[in-house]
């Protein structure tokens, strides 16, 4: 069960913004389902961060499936969530303010804030560090600005543009975009274990991206996918390195985990990085 004892490495990444999803299902992999019909559908690809075509078999599958490119973009891309709020005196909040708190699938336990539509207030919650939805803010102020009704009858949209209710003028504001964990490892580390097509029962390991651990499974001896390793160490080496946390606009910290729980101080916020 020994893992490589690696240092935290600062790397830079100015190309990809944090992966922020309006809906958790946008992170599901394309699932053609068990039927064999041919239907052109679209899914959101978390690696390319774009809506792409895939062939759907006509039954089952999952929610990351849309009849048109436009519908996919509307549900899963950030641009469509960041609309300027209506210019009436009683302005509407962005749609994502009404999404329920979503800790996501990772285990980072980061303090974040979300707008609770029941209490009509921004409240604290524990965020796992990846995926989730856009009702997720680094600060209470940011959450209030965007989702709570302001005292002067205005709200701030997610680009940080204040809409003045009196004259409908747009005033730039500086609001921070929430920073999230990202997965920068090989894409197959996020695929499910696949036994394959043959009849053997070989002991193999696969990376379970939901629990963040390498787990054993029985491999049939042929077929399957690349999330298939002969040892736990090999699995960890290939897949555990992938979780990266952004610490500033240009910088990322690669959280290569050690076996003991360790405290990492990042951007004034203490979090626990747990062992995989």
């Amino acid at each position: 069960d020994s893992e490589e004892d690696e240092e935290h490495t600062i790397i830079t990444d100015t190309e990809l913004p944090p992966l922020k999803l309006m809906h958790s299902f946008c992170a599901f992999k394309a699932d053609d389902g068990p039927c064999k019909a041919i239907m052109k559908r679209f899914f959101f690809n978390i690696f390319t961060r774009q809506c792409e075509e895939f062939i759907y078999g006509g039954c089952e599958g999952n929610q990351n499936r849309f009849e048109s490119l436009e519908e996919c973009k509307k549900m899963c891309t950030r641009d469509n969530a960041n609309r300027i709020i209506k210019t009436t005196l009683q302005q509407e909040k962005p749609d994502f303010c009404f999404l329920e708190e979503d800790p996501g699938i990772c285990r980072g336990y980061i303090t974040r804030y979300f707008y609770n539509n029941q209490t009509k207030q921004c409240e604290r919650f524990k965020y796992g560090g990846c995926l989730g939805n856009m009702n997720n803010f680094e600060t209470l102020e940011e959450c209030k600005n965007i989702c709570e009704d302001g005292p002067n009858g205005f709200q701030v949209d997610n680009y940080g543009t204040q809409l003045n209710a009196v004259n409908n003028s747009l005033t730039p504001q500086s609001t921070k975009v929430p920073s999230l964990f990202e997965f920068h490892g090989p894409s197959w580390c996020l695929t499910p274990a696949d036994r394959g097509l043959c009849r053997a029962n070989e002991n193999r390991f696969y990376y379970n991206s939901v629990i963040g651990k390498c787990r054993p499974f029985k491999y049939s001896g042929c077929g399957g996918n690349e999330n298939n390793f002969t040892s736990k160490q090999e699995c960890l080496r290939a897949c555990k390195k992938g979780f990266i946390q952004r610490i500033s606009k240009g910088g990322l910290i690669k959280t290569k985990r050690k076996r003991k729980k360790q405290r990492v101080k990042i951007a004034y916020e203490e979090i626990f990085v747990k062992n995989m």
Partner: antibody, heavy 115, light 106 residues
């Protein structure tokens, strides 16, 4: 509304080729779905023969693979069935259908194989 | 290939009765699909992916099942339901049909 219409000769001689056309109106065959040929024998038994997908890929019933070809003409929004070396056993009503189990079928055309 | 066996071959029912017809597959399939065919007409998609009613199908029809055993049920049969019903699997090439259940209304 999507409509499919089969056309072709109603009588074919044994050992010749059977050729049928399915003309689709109200929907582009390059937009989506698989476009199927299905036949129904005189005793009412149904057999899926094959399809051509919106992208042009084909899939055939293995029992017919050596004799069947499904092609298309996208400019006319038509797809075609060619069945070679026919015998009297190929006498049937031939249907074209969009994505067999949830789409419209044509009204069918009876093809008799006889000398 | 997967063979689909339908039973009964002939089903006779009076209006208002509940009827069930079954379709058994020689190997497990992910879903079953059903068609209704009336004399002189082409088959119409009736129930797809085991339990989903096709457009225009009355709510008295339902489908269920899994693995190798599937069924189509009509809660209160009406005269217009007289037809032959075929099951079809779309899980394994070749995509096969059952031999049909003919429903007669007394």
């Amino acid at each position: 509304d999507v409509q499919l219409q089969e056309s072709g000769p109603g009588l074919v001689k044994p050992s010749q080729s059977l050729s049928l056309t399915c003309t689709v109106s109200g929907y582009s065959i390059t937009s989506d779905y698989a476009w199927n040929w299905i036949r129904q024998f005189p005793g009412n038994k149904l057999e899926w023969m094959g399809y051509i997908s919106y992208s042009g890929s084909t899939s055939y019933n293995p029992s017919l693979k050596s004799r069947i070809s499904i092609t298309r003409d996208t400019s006319k929004n038509q797809f075609f069935l060619q069945l070679n070396s026919v015998t009297t056993e190929d006498t049937a009503t031939y249907y074209c259908a969009r994505w067999a189990y949830d789409g419209p079928w044509g009204q069918g055309t009876l093809v008799t194989v006889s000398a | 290939q997967i063979v689909l066996s339908q039973s009964p071959a002939l089903l006779s029912a009076s209006p208002g009765e509940k009827v069930t017809m079954t379709c058994r597959a020689s190997s497990s399939v992910s879903h079953m699909h059903w068609y209704q065919q009336k004399p002189g007409s082409s088959p119409k998609p009736w129930i797809y992916a085991t339990s989903n009613l096709a457009s225009g199908v009355p709510a008295r029809f339902s489908g269920s099942g899994s693995g190798t055993s599937y069924s189509l049920t009509i809660t209160r049969v009406e005269a217009e339901d007289a037809a032959t019903y075929y099951c079809q699997q779309w899980s394994s090439n070749p995509f096969t049909f059952g031999s049909g259940t003919k429903l007669e209304i007394k």
